[in-house]
């Protein structure tokens, strides 16, 4: 039991698979931790060993590769279940070793149940389609390597619980599902069921993903600053609270980082001495356009504060914009009370 480089439990790769379906799980060592692949390791005389810890147990035990019909097997760096059972849930470890070298990593595998409408605790990948953008396709995910290219599986597509047949703008095309023109009404969960034969048995692979229809890049514009604007003047007396909202609309842009910030006299609020607070809120439209509001607040504004430059800035992948707020000191109304009182004095 010499020292082994232990990468611990890799919770980033929380693997979920459906009960009673085939599952092929690659050892994460070669994908994420080591700089060489399985073939190199194997030809260098290293051996890959698998073991597991059952759910709610602490005891590591070897995986039984002598089950009927080879239900669990290993092929190169892949652990196969044909098919899975609910009690296969647990933490699996793959260890690569020889007499002088050892490296291992564990990962959680959860076998989940689904109902007849494919509802389950499975975390679903999200595929974004652009609204009214022309033909777009989604592909049945994670089915590579389950059957050879000579095998022609049957693929059935469902939206929610319903088999996709004679849908207006959604057409099944084998492993692909084509959306002729994506609309908000196409939002939902789509499932492909891949059925293939193997050694006289029939297996099913169920893959569900969420389709979200988002704003089209054709309609995307730079950020739009709704506030501050030309029509609102922030007129305050010293001692009052100054509140200026910076409200910015961002078109949906895939992988764009939307930023909003204030500058006061050309500096970030953190870099100046005045007591200013910024509160941010974010809302989204149905097509994931974003509105960000940052409210700049000075509790007790001074006459100096009312002569500063307050600029709202925004940036997205489409560009940077800015707008200065119109701030001014309120001129106090003249007070006539004393003069009037004198005027009404008794003679």
């Amino acid at each position: 039991s010499e020292r082994c480089d232990d990468w611990g439990l890799d919770t980033m790769r929380q693997i979920q698979v459906f009960e009673d379906e085939p599952a092929r799980i690659k050892c994460p060592l070669f994908e994420h931790f080591l700089k060489f692949n399985y073939s190199t390791a194997h030809s260098a005389g290293l051996t890959l060993i698998w073991y597991w810890t059952r759910q709610d147990r602490d005891l590591e035990e070897p995986i039984n590769f002598r089950l009927p019909e080879n239900r669990i097997s290993k092929e190169k760096d892949v652990l196969w279940f044909r098919p899975t059972l609910l009690n296969d849930t647990g933490n699996y470890t793959c260890m690569l070793r020889n007499t002088t070298y050892c490296s291992k990593v564990a990962f959680p595998l959860e076998v989940v149940q689904k109902d007849s409408c494919f509802n389950s605790p499975m975390k679903l990948p999200v595929h974004k389609l652009y609204i009214e953008y022309g033909i777009q396709r989604i592909t049945c995910p994670n089915v590579d390597g389950y059957f050879p290219s000579s095998v022609k599986p049957t693929i059935t597509w469902y939206m929610g619980c319903y088999k996709i047949q004679n849908f207006n703008n959604v057409i099944p095309e084998g492993m692909n599902l084509s959306f002729l023109i994506a609309l908000i009404s196409n939002n939902g969960n789509y499932t492909c069921v891949v059925t293939y034969p193997e050694n006289g048995r029939t297996f099913h692979l169920t893959r569900t993903l969420t389709v979200k229809v988002v704003g089209s890049p054709k309609n995307a514009v730079p950020p739009v600053i709704h506030s501050p604007n030309d029509h609102v003047v922030y007129e305050k007396e010293p001692g009052e609270e100054l509140l200026i909202p910076c409200t910015v609309y961002f078109s949906f842009l895939m992988d764009s980082r939307n930023e909003v910030w204030w500058t006061i006299d050309g500096k970030k609020p953190d870099d100046i001495t005045i007591d200013v607070t910024i509160n941010e809120s974010i809302s989204h439209s149905r097509t994931e356009d974003e509105t960000r509001t940052q409210i700049l607040s000075i509790k007790k504004v001074t006459s100096e504060d009312l002569k500063r430059s307050y600029v709202c800035h925004a940036r997205s992948a489409k560009g940077e914009v800015a707008k200065a707020a119109k701030v001014k000191q309120k001129v106090p109304a003249p007070r006539y009370t004393v003069e009037l009182a004198c005027g009404f004095g008794a003679t």
């Epitope: 030309d230 500058t263 050309g266 600029v311 940077e320 914009v321 707008k323 001014k328």
Partner: antibody, heavy 121, light 111 residues
Amino acid sequence: QEQLVESGGGLVQPEGSLTLTCQASGFTFSSYYVICWVRQAPGKGLEWIACIGTGDGLTYYASWAKGRFTISKTSSTTVTLQMTSLTAADTATYFCARDRYATVSGILNLWGPGTLVTVSS
Amino acid sequence: DVVMTQTPASVEAAVGGTVTIKCQASQNIYSNCAWYQQKLGQRPKLLIYYVSTLESGVPSRFEGSGYGTEFTLTISDLQSADAATYYCQYTYDSSSSTSWAFGGGTEVVVK
């Protein structure tokens, strides 16, 4: 390196017309930019003429320039300024400049070297 | 339309000295003021925008201040390379009307 270069200047007769071109390099007008024309009469100050948003095509003109001057985006790297009914008062170096922001702000942080227009008979 | 009036028309100062240029707007323009430097025979260069924000690459010897109708550009520790004409500009992006007035310019002569 981002650059703007003006061309098309020269000698033109009074009441004549001229088209100036602003050529961009290092960036393209396929993205959202605001390109403006500013002029400077010999020994005088700067005078803003017009701007165009390259993404939305929106145009902005100084009140005195409306009607005689037309700003257009003619390709992904060129913006033009068409000038008509020219007089001696239009003699100036014409600069094209880019707005600092993606939508019009008037803050111009990239300038071309300018092209001289002389209106004379 | 807004008119920007710059004073003085010309100013002379020694290397290492300080120069102050003033710009007055004909109406309240809040913080919509920028400053440009133009050396003889060259294109203008943005120095400062929104009254006091320094454009990247501009030395901190250049400082903008003011608000509303009165704006100031201060150049401290004057260098011979600062000899140029300086323009203030009203920068405004109203959707209803656009009028970006420049001041008449101030020539800075470095002794």
